[in-house]
Each structure stands twice: as structure tokens, then as C-alpha cells.
Interface confidence: low
């Protein structure tokens, strides 16, 4: 494929192979300057598949706090405000990258880790298995 | 709180302050061994607030490929399979951490970056603004 030329101002790296150890600046740059978190913050309550947010904390992980969604109901809320069990509330899951301290308890050495988190819930038509 | 003693086998770090530059092993450890992706894979199509997945690519970012959800409809799909505009399909967004090459095009130097991604869509009751 097309190779972007290496910037001559890059730090040296002893191992050019992948997987490799790289330098990471933990001074987070936030690209979300024009987003308004309030706009989406109440969806968990207004959704037809509402969810609660649970705090997941791990001091050996960066970020140490992650919020996990748990669907409130097996079914979905209908127009009358009741739970309709002909539909299902299901979690929308996403794989995200986190940093895991490695070796453990090290302040400056990490390993990338993929974890699966539930971000919210959506209402789906159930898959009906017909018995022959 | 309880302070976990620093592991004596940690690599040396010149700067002990935070924010800081740390060493990160890019050999990803995947914790999702017991998850079944088939269970959630077709929710985008079965949801009452269905969405399409769009590929967002940036070679200066790690991971370079991120999939973004875009809600298919303004309204939600009702029991008859029609779009009901009394309800709204809205994206569920999550802030995730990615690595941004810094300086640009460097193979072994990154900065942590927070970006907002749409993971899927959910159906919500609209906020009705009554005119006085």
C-alpha cells in the first residue's frame, strides 16, 4: 500500500516491528468541542428501551472509570407506558480500547486492551424460532 | 485511599508528573473471549430505530478504522413496519479513547485523544415544546 513517509522528528524506536512498544502522551486531546452532552444525556430515560448506568471501576485500567448500560426491562415501553414483551430491549455493545497497567501497579507502563462495553439499549423485534 | 506499592520491575520514567508520556505495548489483549458477536450483530436492522454503519478511516489514528452509526429515519418503526414520526430515532453516542500519531506520521509516538462516536440508535419520546 501507500506508505506515508516517516516524520524525521519522530522519537527513536528500538523495535520497528508490530506489535511494538510506543510512547503515548496521556495529556488527552478532546476533539468533541462542538458537541453538547446534555442533548443525549436523558435518552436513557426517554427511550422505549430505557437503561440504567452502572459504574465500573478498575485502578489498573486507564480510564479507571467506565459507565456500563443495563437495560431496565426485557421488553420495550409501548405508547401506554407499559412494558410490551412482544419486543425486546437489548444492549448496544461496542469494543473500546483501554490501557491496562503492565506490569501491574506500574505508573508509566501500559498495554492496549480491548473491552466490550454496553453503551445503551435499543428496542428490537425478537427472533421467533418456530417449532416444526 | 489505599495506595498500591509501585512494582519494582516497572520501566524507568523520566517524568513522574501527570500528564506524562508512558510506554504502551500495542500488542492488544482482547478480554472479550466469552462474548458472542452474533447476538448483537443484527440489531441495526431489527431495531425500531434502525441504523446504517459507515466506515470512518484515518491513517493517523489508532485504530485507523472506526464504524459510525447513522440512524436511518427521523422517526421510529411501528408495529406495521411504517415510520412513526411521533417518536424519534436518536444516536447513542460514546466518548472513546484513540491514539493520534504525534508528531504526524510517526510510527512509534502517539497522544491520547477522546472522540465521540455514534454506536447505534434508540427510539425516544420527543420533547414537545408547547407554544405559550
Amino acid at each position: 500500500g501507500i506508505t506515508i513517509p516517516r516524520n524525521p522528528g519522530c522519537p527513536n524506536s528500538e523495535d520497528k516491528n508490530f506489535p511494538r512498544t510506543v510512547m503515548v502522551n496521556l495529556n488527552i486531546h478532546n476533539r468533541n468541542t462542538n458537541t453538547n452532552p446534555k442533548r443525549s444525556s436523558d435518552y436513557y430515560n426517554r427511550s422505549t428501551s430505557p437503561w440504567n448506568l452502572h459504574r465500573n471501576e478498575d485502578p489498573e485500567r486507564y480510564p479507571s472509570v467506565i459507565w456500563e448500560a443495563k437495560c431496565r426491562h426485557l421488553g420495550c415501553i409501548n405508547a401506554d407506558g407499559n412494558v410490551d414483551y412482544h419486543m425486546n430491549s437489548v444492549p448496544i455493545q461496542q469494543e473500546i480500547l483501554v490501557l491496562r497497567r503492565e506490569p501491574p501497579h506500574c505508573p508509566n507502563s501500559f498495554r492496549l486492551e480491548k473491552i466490550l462495553v454496553s453503551v445503551g439499549c435499543t428496542c428490537v423485534t425478537p427472533i421467533v424460532h418456530h417449532v416444526a | 485511599g489505599i495506595t498500591i506499592p509501585r512494582n519494582p520491575g516497572c520501566p524507568n520514567s523520566e517524568d513522574k508528573n501527570f500528564p506524562r508520556t508512558v510506554m504502551v505495548n500495542l500488542n492488544i489483549h482482547n478480554r472479550n473471549t466469552n462474548t458472542n458477536p452474533k447476538r448483537s450483530s443484527d440489531y441495526y436492522n431489527r431495531s425500531t430505530s434502525p441504523w446504517n454503519l459507515h466506515r470512518n478511516e484515518d491513517p493517523e489514528r489508532y485504530p485507523s478504522v472506526i464504524w459510525e452509526a447513522k440512524c436511518r429515519h427521523l422517526g421510529c418503526i411501528n408495529a406495521d413496519g411504517n415510520v412513526d414520526y411521533h417518536m424519534n430515532s436518536v444516536p447513542i453516542q460514546q466518548e472513546i479513547l484513540v491514539l493520534r500519531r504525534e508528531p504526524p506520521h510517526c510510527p512509534n509516538s502517539f497522544r491520547l485523544e477522546k472522540i465521540l462516536v455514534s454506536v447505534g440508535c434508540t427510539c425516544v419520546t420527543p420533547i414537545v415544546h408547547h407554544v405559550a
Epitope: I4 | S41, D42, E57, D58, P59
Partner: antibody, heavy 118, light 110 residues
Framework: EVQLLESGGGLVQPGGSLRLSCAAS????????MSWVRQAPGKGLEWVSA????????YYADSVKGRFTISRDNSKNTLYLQMNSLRAEDTAVYYC???????????WGQGTMVTVSS | NFMLTQPHSVSESPGKTVTISCTRS????????VQWYQQRPGSAPTIVIF?????PSGVPDRFSGSIDSSSNSASLTISRLKTEDEADYYC?????????FGGGTKLTVL
């Protein structure tokens, strides 16, 4: 109207090289990923390669990896496929396609014939 | 890598309905979108269904697509068949790094 015009096909000996071009018009070329798809005589379609809109990422089928190189010149609205170490089994009509999203060839050219034979 | 399996040929009379199946050998078909392409003799392929069931503008509503997660298969259904529908039809899907086409199905309108 989206138009894709392939050129550069022809007869080449096994082990030889050929460079295909695809001239694009009617859309903002740099905004779209592009692909090459081929079809051997009397056979089905086979994806060959794809490239992102910026040209920063490229993808290849296992059958051509290491032999073919996809590239693009966004200033010329042109897609390329450099084919080296050609084999008889590379004989096909080569189509260039504009991707709607990754993996979805929304618009196709009319194709250019490549024949690898001694 | 996975494969997509289609019937080699199908035939039906004008005015009738025909369904062409496409089965993924491994991995979930529902993970990524399925497309269907029509190729008339001597012409380039054109897309008739994308994202499982979406029709591009200009494609008649006689064409419809669906997927069945339980059988890991997709289907293209053409109703009210016309002689002009006679062509080869290819299903196609992808994963993050490759694109795969089915072997193609020759539709004959009797």
C-alpha cells in the same frame, strides 16, 4: 452523472507488467473509496483491491497481494492498478468501481480486458 | 476466508416471483451489509440492492432483499418477472479488510 473509464488493458506475457487507469468524473473523487473488481471469461466477479479516499489505506485480495498495487491521484481524478508478475489466471475484464460505503460498489466502469498469454 | 454460495441457475415464467439465495460459509452474515448486483450479457454489473434491503433510485420496487440470521443467508426476490430481468445476479458482502462475491446465479425468464 458518475462516469468511470478504464484503460491500459491488453495482451501481456506471463511474468510481465501492466498498469491500468480509471478516469473518474461527475463526483468529488477524493471523497470516495475506490475498488478494482475483475471477471475472468465466463466466470464470476472477484474483488481485487480497494483504496480509501485519501489514498492512505489500501486493501488486497490474497490472490494478488504482493503483486498488485492500487494507488490514486486525487489531483487528476484517476485510480490506478499496477500489476506485476502477471499469471495466466489474472486474465479477466478489470472493472473500477466507486464505493458507496466500504465494500459496496455503487457505480462501475465498463471494464478493460487484460489477457496474460505466451 | 469465508465464501458466499448461490444456486448456479434459476428459471421462472414472466409475471411470476423468483427468489435467489446466498449463504455465508462462516462468520455471521448479519455483521455486515449484503449487496446484490445484476449483470446483463456484455455489460458491467449494476447494483440493485444495497445494505440488505435498500434499493438505489431507478431500481423498480419489484426487487427486494432480505437476510435471515438463523440460516446465515440472504435472499433477492424479484416479483412480476419481466424478460428484461434475465441476467446474472451476484450477492456480495465484506468484512473490515476484504470483499467477497458469490459465484453468481443465472436467471432465465422462460
Amino acid at each position: 452523472e458518475v462516469q468511470l473509464l478504464e484503460s491500459g488493458g491488453g495482451l501481456v506475457q506471463p511474468g510481465g507488467s501492466l498498469r491500468l487507469s480509471c478516469a473518474a468524473s461527475g463526483f468529488t473523487f477524493s471523497s470516495y473509496a475506490m475498488s478494482w473488481v475483475r471477471q475472468a471469461p465466463g466466470k464470476g466477479l472477484e474483488w481485487v483491491s480497494a483504496i480509501s479516499g485519501s489514498g492512505g489505506s489500501t486493501y488486497y485480495a490474497d490472490s494478488v497481494k504482493g503483486r498488485f498495487t492500487i494507488s490514486r491521484d486525487n489531483s487528476k481524478n484517476t485510480l490506478y492498478l499496477q500489476m506485476n508478475s502477471l499469471r495466466a489466471e489474472d486474465t479477466a475484464v478489470y472493472y473500477c468501481a466507486r464505493d458507496l460505503i466500504w465494500g459496496v460498489a455503487g457505480s462501475w466502469g465498463q471494464g478493460t480486458m487484460v489477457t496474460v498469454s505466451s | 476466508n469465508f465464501m458466499l454460495t448461490q444456486p448456479h441457475s434459476v428459471s421462472e415464467s414472466p409475471g411470476k416471483t423468483v427468489t435467489i439465495s446466498c449463504t455465508r460459509s462462516s462468520g455471521s452474515l448479519a455483521n455486515y451489509y449484503v449487496q446484490w448486483y445484476q449483470q446483463r450479457p456484455g455489460s458491467a454489473p449494476t447494483i440493485v440492492i444495497f445494505a440488505n434491503n435498500q434499493r438505489p433510485s431507478g431500481v423498480p420496487d419489484r426487487f427486494s432483499g432480505s437476510i435471515d440470521s438463523s440460516s446465515n443467508s440472504a435472499s433477492l426476490t424479484i416479483s412480476r418477472l419481466k424478460t428484461e430481468d434475465e441476467a446474472d445476479y451476484y450477492c456480495q458482502t465484506y468484512d473490515p479488510y476484504s470483499v467477497v462475491f458469490g459465484g453468481g446465479t443465472k436467471l432465465t425468464v422462460l
